[in-house]
Interface confidence: medium
């Protein structure tokens, strides 16, 4: 049999070897495709089959606009003038070249020594699905699950049957390297079909700023508050990327998700204690602030009344 590859939407002609110049009953096409249940028989005298395929006077089979459902096996059996039976067998596959792939949400800047999303490569409208691959400085980038992580997703359009591919690249660039050039290419995996390439992106690589010291700011100043007042603790640190901040009271971590602000409304004596914050930086490890002592006393500065906080986002959880 012969393998045929045809582009979706284009006509396909399959010739029937040995067909007489003026076909008689002695020519028959059989097809088994996504449109048929098992084998469908077409003969020259038969009506055109749903305008999908018809036998031409010379015995060839014409599919005016081939689609995904026309993938399958096509067989012709003809008897030539000498009475000898000649068979033709075709295995038909279809393809669709997608639009040019593109990198969406490209990073303009990467931070060394920490994982960074470079961008998401998107290809729309392919058949078969094909593959996306990433390149660094023109060379294939092999995911290793650590410094180079690729997350892939393939979706099929429910009506057209065409595929959309997405590939998200996350890298951990080394310090002191050159400016990298990332690109992505789509390949259908068919012979003689060149890959389609995205425009390259060149994000800058920024050295991570080591934490310059961590400050714990307390309101009211001094940390002394009257019962029923509000205490706001803010952990200030200049580092890139921003670290995660956890809170400690009397040496014990508080049951809160990371946040740079800790709000204590309507304080009572049970809130008294030594508070500190810990900044956890991916490339520099944890760093603890100097502690502050929160005291609740009748003579202390009047803390902000609990009902007067304006909802400015000061809270005990980070997004």
């Amino acid at each position: 049999g012969q393998n045929i590859t045809a582009r979706i939407g284009e006509p396909l002609m399959l010739s029937c070897k040995g067909a007489p110049k003026k076909p008689t009953q002695k020519l028959e096409w059989k097809l088994n495709t996504g449109r048929t249940e098992a084998w469908k028989v077409l003969s020259p005298q038969g009506d055109p089959w749903d305008s999908v395929a018809r036998i031409l006077p010379n015995g060839s089979l014409l599919l005016p606009a081939i689609g995904i459902v026309d993938e399958g096996t096509f067989r012709c059996r003809a008897t030539n003038r000498l009475g000898k039976e000649v068979k033709s067998n075709y295995r038909v596959r279809v393809y669709q070249i997608p639009g040019k792939p593109e990198i969406v949400n490209p990073a303009s800047e990467l931070t060394a020594n920490v994982p960074n999303k470079v961008g998401t490569c998107v290809s729309e409208g392919s058949y078969p699905a094909g593959t996306l691959s990433w390149h660094l400085d023109g060379k294939p980038l092999i995911p290793d699950g650590k410094g180079t992580v690729v997350k892939e997703e393939t979706r099929r359009h429910p009506e057209t049957g065409l595929f959309t591919l997405r590939s998200e690249l996350t890298v951990t660039p080394a310090q002191g390297g050159t400016t990298p050039t990332y690109s992505c290419s789509f390949s259908l995996g068919l012979p003689r079909r060149r890959p389609l390439n995205t425009a390259p992106i060149q994000p800058r690589v920024r050295e991570p700023l080591p934490p310059e010291g961590i400050q714990l700011l307390v309101e009211p100043e001094g940390g002394t508050v009257a019962p029923g007042g509000t205490v706001t603790l803010t952990c200030a640190i200049s580092a890139q990327p921003p670290p995660q901040i956890h809170w400690i009271k009397d040496g014990t971590p508080l049951p809160l998700a990371p946040s740079p602000v800790l709000l204590l409304p309507e304080v009572g004596h049970e809130d008294e204690g030594i508070y500190s914050c810990v900044a956890t930086h991916p490339s520099h490890g944890p760093q603890e602030s100097p502690p502050v002592n929160i005291r609740v006393t009748e003579t202390g500065d009047e803390g902000q009344a609990a009902g007067s906080v304006d909802g400015s986002g000061l809270g005990t959880l980070a997004l």
Partner: antibody, heavy 117, light 109 residues
Framework: QVQLQQSGAELVRPGTSVKVSCKAS????????IDWVNQRPGQGLEWIGV????????NYNEKFTGKATLTADKSSSTAYMQLSSLTSDDSAVYFC??????????WGQGTSVTVSS | QAVVTQESALTTSPGETVTLTCRSS?????????ANWVQEKPDHLFTGLIG???NRAPGVPARFSGSLIGDKAALTITGAQTEDEAIYFC?????????FGGGTKLTVL
Amino acid sequence: QVQLQQSGAELVRPGTSVKVSCKASGYAFTNYLIDWVNQRPGQGLEWIGVINPGSGGTNYNEKFTGKATLTADKSSSTAYMQLSSLTSDDSAVYFCARRRVDTMDYWGQGTSVTVSS
Amino acid sequence: QAVVTQESALTTSPGETVTLTCRSSTGAVTTSNYANWVQEKPDHLFTGLIGGTNNRAPGVPARFSGSLIGDKAALTITGAQTEDEAIYFCALWYSNHWVFGGGTKLTVL
């Protein structure tokens, strides 16, 4: 006085979503966290997650990631929990509770969600 | 996931002192578990009693107190009253989530 008023009982079809509300009154909404907890018929309590109404920050029990979505509307002092792709396993009474750092003090009256075809 | 275990039922008399406990499958309960105690009365009426191991919630009578006893968290009711008949749940914090115990049904006869 502090009150958490939850929305009424829901009877919903499998595969659909439901949104339960929890309206807070009697205190400064953004000063406290709102935890969500469920109780299945004849079972104990299970923590779903928490939202900080001031910042919108959330923290979920891994088991409920993708199932529950917590939001809050500061202007109406209301917290919401949306449950998606419901199955009969999600039939339970759902509670909101106010939390001050480490203490869940006030609780809503509960919202019964029944998933049935 | 950790399992939190409580006595399934306890009975006491009015005026008596009763202690409910809360054990963790991961080892000793510590202040880092921020034990909470919650009371459930009929019709899903929940009230927070204790948080952070030993901090009474607002408006909770002084007869309720929280502590650590040995390797467990404990809720002590000193001078139980008939209205204390309820189910009591404890909750423990494990790094990033809370786990509740199965509850203790307290009967005050």
